[in-house]
């Protein structure tokens, strides 16, 4: 149920885009292709580039994206495709002038002299978004997520912009400097991966972003699990990013009782961040448990 | 720059048919390709388009009756099993660029057509 | 759905106007391109993105976007009888799916 053909606007292309990455990343870290045979992920792959293929058509001038080609270009939907296209980048050719071009239109269009990064135009499909929704630490959760997306877009595209790396630092800055008043579970989620990613997640910080978890086990707001699931998977790749091993197990036995294999409405964000935290953990965790988790693939009839 | 089309001929219904856009001055790794047809006295029609990676898409009505590929200097348009509402001049067309700057997705180098009749 | 009317006609050195409706769907959200064809012959952009002219294009030929109306207009001012032909809009609604309007005959009279 997780390999979907894409299509619609610049949104809906993406949403639908998204668990087909995710279940082709997972299988892949987790070598189970076996279980489902090696011509279904040849089948994903297409879905994939059809998916890259039909994006760009959303791709504009500036090498921003928006839901529609005369829409404004939106600062989470442009960070988004950055966050997928790098994970693709394995997967499928995709041009670097594309991903590169949208990592640095984020830089210099939309991040402040204070390393915040601004939206000034939201996206439509908001239940895409995730934990983001309606959140009233904003600026840290927007800031978190743009920040892990060029990240992830580093190493392909440092390079070709200049200006990454200092932004990047900027943007830490930031987190770390707001950090501790964090109210919301899933924003000490999200921004403590940021930071674990640049080995800033330390000292008060990090006991911060620990004392957090209810029951040691999860990263909840009162609301949507969805929303849970997401944050808790930001959460587990921070412990993964700082080999908290011990920490990890009860996490990822939390996620896994959760039963959610993804897909659904407002499911974008959930789908993507256990699958990418679940594949990590059974990559890096030494002698991790064996996840049963159900990946169904049933390839779309064309 | 320039696009032109060959192939078209008179074939018999259900007789599949080729048709061949050979293209000059520009390279097929840069720029997508449709292909547009005109029924004798009517309008265009959209039928499909391929991209430089490959991925091809058609309109609703010409999924499963169309097929196009490409080698590097040619776009092929298969008309699968022809009948006579196929007659028509086809049309091979460049789409502006690529990769997807969306303010330029429109057919900006058409060739001058082939007429394909499919008659009894 | 793009519709266009089938015919429309003007004098020589008048101004004509011809409309594409956008039946489903938002026009705000979509570029409009404009193409003439001659009889016999390949059509030639004269107007994409709802109001950029191709170079070799005279000014003479326009677009715009009417939002209320949820339509695309081409304008063509000082007609001459080389205008006389048949006009389509067409709209790229994503990078899989291009929608021609039907087509209006330009009939430029003495």
């Known amino acids: 149920h997780l390999i979907v053909t894409p299509s619609g606007c610049g949104e809906q292309n993406m949403i639908g885009m998204t668990p087909t990455v995710i279940a082709v990343h997972y299988l892949d870290e987790t070598e189970q292709w076996e279980k489902f045979g090696l011509e279904k992920r040849q089948g994903a792959l297409e879905l994939i580039k059809k998916g890259y293929t039909q994006q760009l058509a959303f791709r504009q001038p500036s090498s921003a994206f928006a839901a529609f080609v005369k829409r404004a270009p939106s600062t989470w939907l442009t960070a988004y495709v950055v966050k997928v296209f790098s994970l693709a980048v394995n997967l499928i050719a995709i041009d670097s002038q594309v991903l590169c071009g949208a990592v640095k239109w984020l830089i210099l269009e939309k991040q402040k002299p204070d390393g915040v990064f601004q939206e000034d135009a939201p996206v439509i499909h908001q239940e895409m978004i995730g934990g983001l929704r309606n959140n009233n630490e904003k600026d840290m959760a927007l800031t978190a997520f743009v920040l892990i997306s060029l990240q992830e877009a580093k190493d392909i595209c440092e390079e070709q912009v200049n200006s990454l790396p200092g932004s990047i630092t900027k943007a830490g800055d930031f987190l770390e400097a707001n950090y501790m008043n964090l109210q919301r579970s899933y924003t000490v989620a999200i921004a403590g991966y940021a930071l674990a990613q640049m080995g800033r997640l330390k000292g008060p910080l990090l006991n911060k972003f620990l004392t957090t978890a209810k029951d040691k086990n999860r990263w909840e707001d009162p609301g949507k699990q969805l929303y849970n699931v997401e944050a808790t998977s930001y959460a587990l790749l921070a412990l993964l990013q700082l080999k908290d091993f011990d920490f990890v197990p009860p996490v990822v036995r939390w996620l896994n009782e959760q039963r959610y294999y993804g897909g659904g409405y407002g499911s974008t964000q959930a789908t993507f961040m256990v699958f990418q935290a679940l594949a990590q953990y059974q990559k890096d965790a030494p002698d991790h448990q064996e996840l049963n988790l159900d990946v169904s693939l049933q390839l779309p009839s064309r | 720059q320039s696009v032109e089309e060959s192939g078209g001929r008179l074939v018999t219904p259900g007789t599949p048919l080729t048709l061949t856009c050979t293209v000059s001055?520009?390279?097929?790794?840069?720029?997508?390709m449709s292909w547009v047809r005109q029924a004798p006295g009517k309008g265009l029609e959209w039928i499909g388009i391929?991209?430089?990676?490959?991925i091809t898409y058609y309109a609703s009505w010409a999924k499963g009756r169309f097929t196009i590929s490409k080698t590097s200097t040619t776009v092929d348009l298969k008309i699968t099993s022809p009948t006579t509402e196929d007659t028509a001049t086809y049309f091979c067309?460049?789409?502006?660029?690529?990769?997807?700057?969306?303010?330029?997705?429109?057919?900006?180098?058409w060739g001058p057509g082939t007429l394909v009749t499919i008659s009894s | 759905v793009l519709t266009q009317p089938q015919s429309v006609s003007g004098s020589l050195g008048q101004t004509v106007s011809m409309s594409c409706k956008c039946d489903?769907?938002?026009?705000?959200?979509?570029?409009v391109h404009w193409y003439q064809q001659h009889p016999g012959k390949a059509p030639t952009t004269v107007i994409y993105?709802?109001?950029?002219?191709p170079s070799g294009v005279p000014d003479r030929f326009s677009g715009s976007i009417d939002s209320t109306s949820n339509s695309a207009s081409l304008t063509i001012t000082g007609l001459l009888a080389e205008d006389e032909a048949d006009y389509y809009c067409?709209?790229?609604?994503?990078?899989?799916?291009?929608?021609f309007g039907g087509g209006t005959q330009l009939t430029v009279t003495g």
């Open positions: 067309a460049r789409v502006v660029s690529w990769p997807g700057y969306t303010t330029e997705y429109y057919f900006n180098i």
């Open positions: 001055g520009f390279s097929l790794s840069s720029y997508a």
């Open positions: 391929i991209y430089p990676n490959d």
């Open positions: 489903s769907g938002n026009i705000d959200n979509y570029y």
């Open positions: 993105n709802d109001d950029q002219r």
């Open positions: 067409l709209s790229s609604v994503s990078s899989d799916n291009y929608v």
